[in-house]
Interface confidence: medium
C-alpha cells in the first residue's frame, strides 16, 4: 500500500490522543534505555510503511501484537485517513481473525514496540533532517 | 456481516442539541472501534468521532467539547450527543465499525439553521 495520499495530520492528532498512550502502558515497567533503536524512517510515507510493517506483520519471536490496543487503533486511523487503505486490509483481516493467538509479551515484543515509538516519533517531526 | 441504522437527525437552531443513534444488528463491541463520520455537501466524508472497546474516544478538532460519544453494549447502540450546534456541522451523519470499505448505510440528516 501506498501511504503517500493519507492525512498526516489528522494521523498524528490520533497518535498524539490515544495511540502514544496504549505503547507507554504496553512498555510500562521497561527502561527507556533498554533498547537501541535499529528501524528507521526518512518521510511520513515511510514511517507509516515501516510502522504497519511492525505492527502487523509477525515476526520471528513475537507474533502477537495485531490484537494490542494501539495495533488495532494504529489500523483505524489507517483506514480511516488513508484512502483505499480499508479495502487492502479486508482480506488480511479475514484470515487474521481465524489465526486469533493467545496475547504474550516477550522481551521480543518489547524491543518491536520500542522501535515503534520510534518511528512514530519521527513520523510526527518529518522537518527534522535524518541522523 | 454488522447491520447499521443511523437516526436522530432533524432541523435544529444554532446553539441546540441533538442526540444521534446507531443500532447495530450485532455486537457492538464484538470488535474494537466504531466511529460517527458526517459528508457536508460537496466535501468529503469525515470522522468526527470515534470510541474504541477500551473505553477511550477520539473528536475532530471541530466538534471538541461540544460533542460527546458513547456507547451501550446491553442495546447494540452508539450515540453522538451534539451540542452548541453550530451551521457548519450541517451534514448527512453515519456510523461505521471497524471497517467500512464494504459499503455505508443511508445516514441521518442534521440541519443547523435559523
Known amino acids: 500500500y501506498d501511504f503517500t495520499n493519507c492525512d498526516f495530520e489528522k494521523i498524528k492528532a490520533a497518535y498524539l490522543s490515544t495511540i502514544s498512550k496504549d505503547l507507554i502502558t504496553y512498555m510500562s515497567g521497561t527502561k527507556s534505555t533498554e533498547f537501541n533503536n535499529t528501524v528507521s524512517c526518512s518521510n511520513r510515507p515511510h514511517c507509516l510503511t515501516e510502522i504497519q510493517s511492525l505492527t502487523f506483520n509477525p515476526t520471528a519471536g513475537c507474533a502477537s501484537l495485531a490484537k494490542e490496543m494501539f495495533a488495532m487503533k494504529t489500523k483505524a486511523a489507517l483506514a480511516i485517513w488513508c484512502p483505499g487503505y480499508s479495502e487492502t486490509q479486508i482480506n488480511a483481516t479475514q484470515a487474521m481473525k481465524k489465526r486469533r493467538k493467545r496475547k504474550v509479551t516477550t522481551n521480543k515484543c518489547l524491543e518491536q514496540v520500542s522501535q515503534l515509538q520510534g518511528l512514530w516519533r519521527r513520523f510526527n517531526r518529518p522537518l527534522l533532517k535524518q541522523q | 456481516e454488522v447491520q447499521l441504522v443511523e437516526s436522530g437527525g432533524g432541523l435544529v437552531q444554532p446553539g441546540g442539541s441533538l442526540r444521534l443513534s446507531c443500532a447495530a444488528s450485532?455486537?457492538?463491541?464484538?470488535?474494537?472501534?466504531m466511529g460517527w463520520f458526517r459528508q457536508a455537501p460537496g466535501k468529503e466524508r469525515e470522522l468526527v468521532s470515534a470510541?474504541?472497546?477500551?473505553?477511550?474516544?477520539y473528536y475532530a478538532d471541530s466538534v471538541k467539547g461540544r460533542f460527546t460519544i458513547s456507547a451501550d453494549n446491553s442495546k447494540n447502540t452508539a450515540y453522538l450527543q451534539m451540542n452548541s450546534l453550530k451551521p457548519e456541522d450541517t451534514a448527512v451523519y453515519y456510523c461505521?465499525?471497524?471497517?467500512f470499505g464494504t459499503g455505508w448505510g443511508q445516514g441521518t440528516l442534521v440541519t443547523v439553521s435559523s
Open positions: 470510541i474504541f472497546s477500551d473505553g477511550s474516544t
Open positions: 461505521a465499525k471497524d471497517y
Open positions: 450485532g455486537s457492538i463491541f464484538s470488535s474494537y472501534w
